[in-house]
């Protein structure tokens, strides 16, 4: 054997982002010469589970039949050949989200902007929390972190769009999670709407105005400007 | 054939130290989570400990901060370091072993005969 064996890849269905008491199948593949598979969870005992390949041998299944607290977090997999054991897969983030009460996602001053104006959204919690996430659905890259500087606990977060596009627009919900995890989230907001009408002076901007890449607009971070508000939060892109 | 097999246990006075050991054949021990459960009369079996193959540990919160748990590879065997023990603390303790999430779910590939532990004065 020449080398290292190749690293497994390792993926989650539904999806990685699963609501608490879902069921999540983790999934490693790796080669029809695996016999073993082990995943591992960081900062848990190793090996945290360990299965015998499926037919034909080049995949592997871990089954999390309700998700819980002792499930979210930072996976990778091996499998064992007969000439030893691979290198790692690329991590997988496994996150729970139903975690703590809903927050509440608000536009200010209003969910209907003109291109070309400024909007903030504001997410809100009940409880202090340190850190907020806010997702636009249908967003290849849906995460916006603001995170507190020092462990401050805040109660809301501000996301201020400015100038906003109708690439803006769309749906959003937001989500708020303490720093000693950030793979346990709350149950998200419920939805808001950003509608993004016309300006005399631009009655139909361009949804690729705003990105520097040939991708459209729903594959890019959303990326609002403007400097963080004194909350004592800094922006993080994921 | 016994392939987890634990002893030091006994009865203590509250505040005493015990130490417990649990020897595993090879193939167990290499290849998995090694720990510690115990159950009161009466009780649910509780997880006091686990360490994996790297030596990462995890502890339970009622014993936080008394109970430590080490593998040694050279031995195949596992301890329970107990100290400041109390009435509490009384039960049978069973060494067990498999993959950590078997542990979460109370239903390790590997189970010893357990030994009983007695703090009392």
């Known amino acids: 054997q020449a080398g290292p064996l190749p690293k497994p890849t390792l993926w989650a269905e539904p999806g990685s982002v699963i609501s608490w008491g879902n069921s999540v199948t983790i999934w490693c593949q790796g080669t029809l010469e695996a016999r073993e598979y082990r995943l591992d969870k960081e900062e848990s005992p190793a090996p945290w589970d360990r299965q015998n390949p499926l037919e034909p041998k080049n995949k592997a299944r871990f089954s999390i039949p309700s998700m819980t607290e002792d499930y979210a977090g930072r996976y990778r997999c091996y499998y064992r050949s007969p000439v030893g054991w691979s290198q790692p897969s690329d991590p997988l983030e496994l996150v729970m989200t139903g975690a703590y009460s809903k927050p509440t996602l608000s536009a200010l001053p209003s969910p209907l902007v003109t291109s070309g104006k400024s909007v903030t959204l504001l997410c809100q919690s009940r409880s202090p929390m340190d850190t907020f996430l806010l997702i636009k659905e249908r967003a290849a890259h849906p995460l916006l972190h603001l995170r507190s500087e020092h462990g401050a606990q805040q109660h809301q977060a501000e996301f201020p769009m400015s100038p906003v596009t109708s690439v803006h627009g769309g749906t959003y919900r937001c989500f708020s999670s303490h720093g000693f995890s950030h793979y346990l989230l709350s149950h998200p907001s419920d939805p808001l709407e950003l509608i993004v009408s016309g300006s005399l002076e631009d009655p139909r901007p361009s949804p690729t105005r705003s990105v520097s890449t040939a991708a459209g607009p729903e594959d890019q971070p959303l990326m609002p400007t403007g400097s963080v508000p004194h909350s004592g939060l800094r922006r993080h892109w994921e | 054939e016994v392939q987890l097999v634990e002893s030091g246990g006994g009865l203590v006075q509250p505040g005493g130290s015990l130490r417990l050991s649990c020897a595993a054949s090879?193939?167990?021990?290499?290849?998995?989570?090694m720990g510690w459960y115990r159950q009161a009369p009466g009780k649910q079996r509780e997880l006091v400990a686990a360490?994996?193959?790297?030596?990462?540990?995890k502890i339970g919160d009622s014993v936080k901060g008394r109970f430590t748990i080490s593998r040694d590879n050279a031995k195949n065997s596992v301890y329970l370091q107990m100290n400041s023990l109390r009435a509490e603390d009384t039960a049978v303790y069973y060494c067990?072993?498999?993959?950590?999430?078997?542990?979460?779910?109370?239903?390790?590939?590997?189970w010893g005969q357990g030994t009983q532990v007695t703090v009392s004065s």
């Open positions: 090879e193939s167990i021990f290499s290849s998995n989570v």
């Open positions: 067990a072993a498999g993959a950590y999430v078997r542990f979460l779910q109370q239903s390790p590939d590997y």
């Open positions: 360490v994996g193959i790297q030596g990462l540990t």
